[in-house]
């Protein structure tokens, strides 16, 4: 058993049918010695008396808010949560496996630049009685500071019969140098509590590996005289690290017909302009990627040919 | 149609072209190592990230873009002195900091070159003959060093009398390649920045 926060405790259980569970001793936070009784949740049934209460915690019916009283007055509370270990592996019931970029990916994180700011998000089908708390650091043995905000519900979508809820959090490394070469990964830890179930999820990454630039901005077409060709131009996104000559991007320019089946023409360039043939009803899209370290491509910025 | 990227004109700043070749070569070598050594811990998640140049050179700090010198998190107190007569500096007025930067890059390359050559000698003794260092990568390191053209004491190749542990050598190779790729990215950024200045 360990303390998650004041008066909230997590009991770790080896989870299998007929398991013996864990013996837990609760102590009433009071100078009083006699006349103390204990109850669980809303029940008025007295579970025991005395300053300490010994219980055998086996399943969720044994978890909850234990309260000690004296003469009708509440003295203190202890909330017991359960953390299930199933055959040596902690349960992952609360969050959905996003399966991207690989199986067992519960947390996904992205950064728009090298400033040390990043966003993580996760999915669940649970809509109520759910709380999250996020901590982060650079490295784990001698951790350096990363400050995270509160996790918020960022999207809701319907998936088949189920509703899916997306939560996200923003974090910022306290003293980040955009040009630094990372040798210690960022660690992100999410505590999830659903009713009386506790779970924790972690992700470890280098900022360089989660970079996904914003799409190029100010995408414009300039027709070339007496030609079907157009000059496409764009700019670096505002959110990208500066100076751009140091933090350079490379670009992919795509000409896509109306039909998805039509052949796509693609050109790769380090410049912020390109000359392409603009077909009728086609659209031109441009996306960006770090020129020197191949992390994710940005989403496409698009403009119609006409 | 996948059209290749047009190579920028290297004339203005000869090291830019070499540094791009370096990044391409080390990235290819790392990819090859990860495929060949699939049963070894060779991914970014599995290896310890060590920097053999730590406390010996200070490339990131010495080559910091002017715009980032205001960022306190980027300023490290490490002081390292370097020789300052490189040919990449030819025909431009160069600040002491730029010379320091390029000589720091040269020292990095020299240290990695020695490590890689020592390691290759060991890998050539492996009866499995599983992996060797790409000669192209070693040649590209050499070319960039020549383009930088700093006068520097030659570092003798390390020789080892004891029987090599090939498993450890291959893991060390992965660690070295990951670190060198990160440094090659920095070098490429620096060359691009200097070229634009």
């Amino acid at each position: 058993i360990w303390e998650l926060k004041k008066d909230v405790y997590v009991v770790e259980l080896d989870w299998y049918p007929d398991a013996p569970g864990e013996m837990v001793v609760l102590t009433c936070d009071t100078p009083e010695e006699d006349g103390i009784t204990w109850t669980l949740d809303q029940s008025s049934e007295v579970l025991g008396s005395g300053k300490t209460l010994t219980i055998q915690v086996k399943e969720f019916g044994d978890a909850g808010q234990y309260t000690c009283h004296k003469g009708g007055e509440v003295l203190s509370h202890s909330l017991l949560l359960l953390h299930k270990k199933e055959d040596g592996i902690w349960s992952t019931d609360i969050l959905k496996d996003q399966k991207e970029p690989k199986n067992k990916t519960f947390l996904r994180c992205e950064a728009k630049n090298y400033s040390g700011r990043f966003t993580c998000w996760w999915l669940t089908t649970i809509s109520t009685d759910l709380t999250f708390s996020v901590k982060s650091s650079r490295g784990s043995s001698d951790p350096q500071g990363v400050t995270c905000g509160a996790a918020t519900l960022s999207a809701e979508r319907v998936r088949g019969d189920n509703k899916e809820y997306e939560y996200s959090v923003e974090c910022q490394e306290d003293s980040a140098c955009p040009a630094a070469e990372e040798s210690l990964p960022i660690e992100v830890m999410v505590d999830a509590v659903h009713k009386l179930k506790y779970e924790n999820y972690t992700s470890s990454f280098f900022i360089r590996d989660i970079i996904k630039p914003d799409p190029p901005k100010n995408l414009q077409l300039k027709p070339l005289k007496n030609s079907r060709q157009v000059e496409v131009s764009w700019e670096y996104p505002d959110t990208w690290s500066t100076p751009h000559s140091y933090f350079s991007l490379t670009f992919c320019v795509q000409v896509q017909g109306k039909s998805k089946r039509e052949k796509k023409d693609r050109v790769f360039t380090d410049k912020t302009s390109a000359t392409v043939i603009c077909r009728k009803n086609a659209s031109i899209s441009v996306r960006a990627q770090d020129r020197y370290y191949s992390s994710s491509w940005s989403e496409w910025a698009s403009v119609p040919c006409s | 149609r996948n059209l290749p990227v047009a190579t920028p004109d290297p004339g203005m700043f000869p090291c830019l072209h070499h540094s791009q070749n370096l990044l391409r070569a080390v990235s290819n070598m790392l990819q090859k190592a990860r495929q060949t050594l699939e049963f070894y811990p060779c991914t970014s998640e599995e290896i310890d990230h060590e920097d053999i140049t730590k406390d010996k050179t200070s490339t990131v700090e010495a080559c910091l873009p002017l715009e980032l010198t205001k960022n306190e998190s980027c300023l490290n107190s490490r002081e390292t002195s370097f020789i300052t007569n490189g040919s990449c500096l030819a025909s431009r007025k160069t600040s002491f900091m730029m010379a320091l930067c390029l000589s720091s890059i040269y020292e990095d390359l020299k240290m990695y070159q020695v490590e890689f050559k020592t390691m290759n000698a060991k890998l050539l003794m492996d009866p499995k003959r599983q992996i060797f260092l790409d000669q192209n990568m070693l040649a590209v390191i050499d070319e960039l060093m020549q383009a930088l053209n700093f006068n520097s004491e030659t570092v003798p190749q390390k020789s080892s009398l004891e029987e090599p542990d090939f498993y450890k050598t291959k893991i060390k190779l992965c660690i070295l390649l990951h670190a060198f790729r990160i440094r090659a990215v920095t070098i490429d950024r620096v060359m691009s920045y200097l070229n634009a200045s």
Partner: antibody, heavy 115, light 112 residues
Framework: QVQLVQSGGGVVQPGRSLRLSCAAS????????MHWVRQAPGKGLEWVAF????????YYADSVKGRFTISRDNSKNTLYLQMKSLRAEDTAVYYC????????WGQGTMVTVSS | SYVLTQPPSVSGTPGQRVTISCSGG????????VKWYQQLPGTAPKLLIY???QRPSGVPDRFSGSKSGTSASLAITGVQAEDEADYYC????????????FGTGTKVTVLG
Amino acid sequence: QVQLVQSGGGVVQPGRSLRLSCAASGFTFSSYGMHWVRQAPGKGLEWVAFIRYDGSNKYYADSVKGRFTISRDNSKNTLYLQMKSLRAEDTAVYYCKTHGSHDNWGQGTMVTVSS
Amino acid sequence: SYVLTQPPSVSGTPGQRVTISCSGGRSNIGPNTVKWYQQLPGTAPKLLIYGNDQRPSGVPDRFSGSKSGTSASLAITGVQAEDEADYYCQSYDRGTHPALLFGTGTKVTVLG
């Protein structure tokens, strides 16, 4: 004590269907994940499928994906394996088992796919 | 396809020490725990070892398990005639959990 009693095995022709059942008692069935494991005659153990305690997630071996469906009825304390498009290579003894560090196995039920 | 490899058979005379190996990889045995089962002919498998080296109550102490890196082993010290059976190791793969990964199985023969 924990008990898992299996039923539903038998002889079936290729291409036909069969449903296996596993009745649980002696524990809170709705709190635990469950597996199906099979063993072809003279061969080793092969995992077939898993279902979460609440039925929300199901996982299958590649060899049965799209043909077999694992399900559970927590109100009846019963686990099921619906097998469709059966093949000769599905011939095996099928076991249900609880998920956890200490597990309990059913007695096994023989499924023979033969024309 | 079995990714946990066991020797097809091992044998020993009564009282001898018999060991069975179970060889895996960095994504299965490496980060996960290992179980061992005993299966007598015509019966369901019986759990002998869980959590690499833990014995459930009722399992004789002549059975012991261990794990090192990406391999595990089961030892029977002082093998007895009733130990003649098939033995299977079981673990998980990091990417496919909760799918069970079973070893190829080892037939233990007690001679004499």
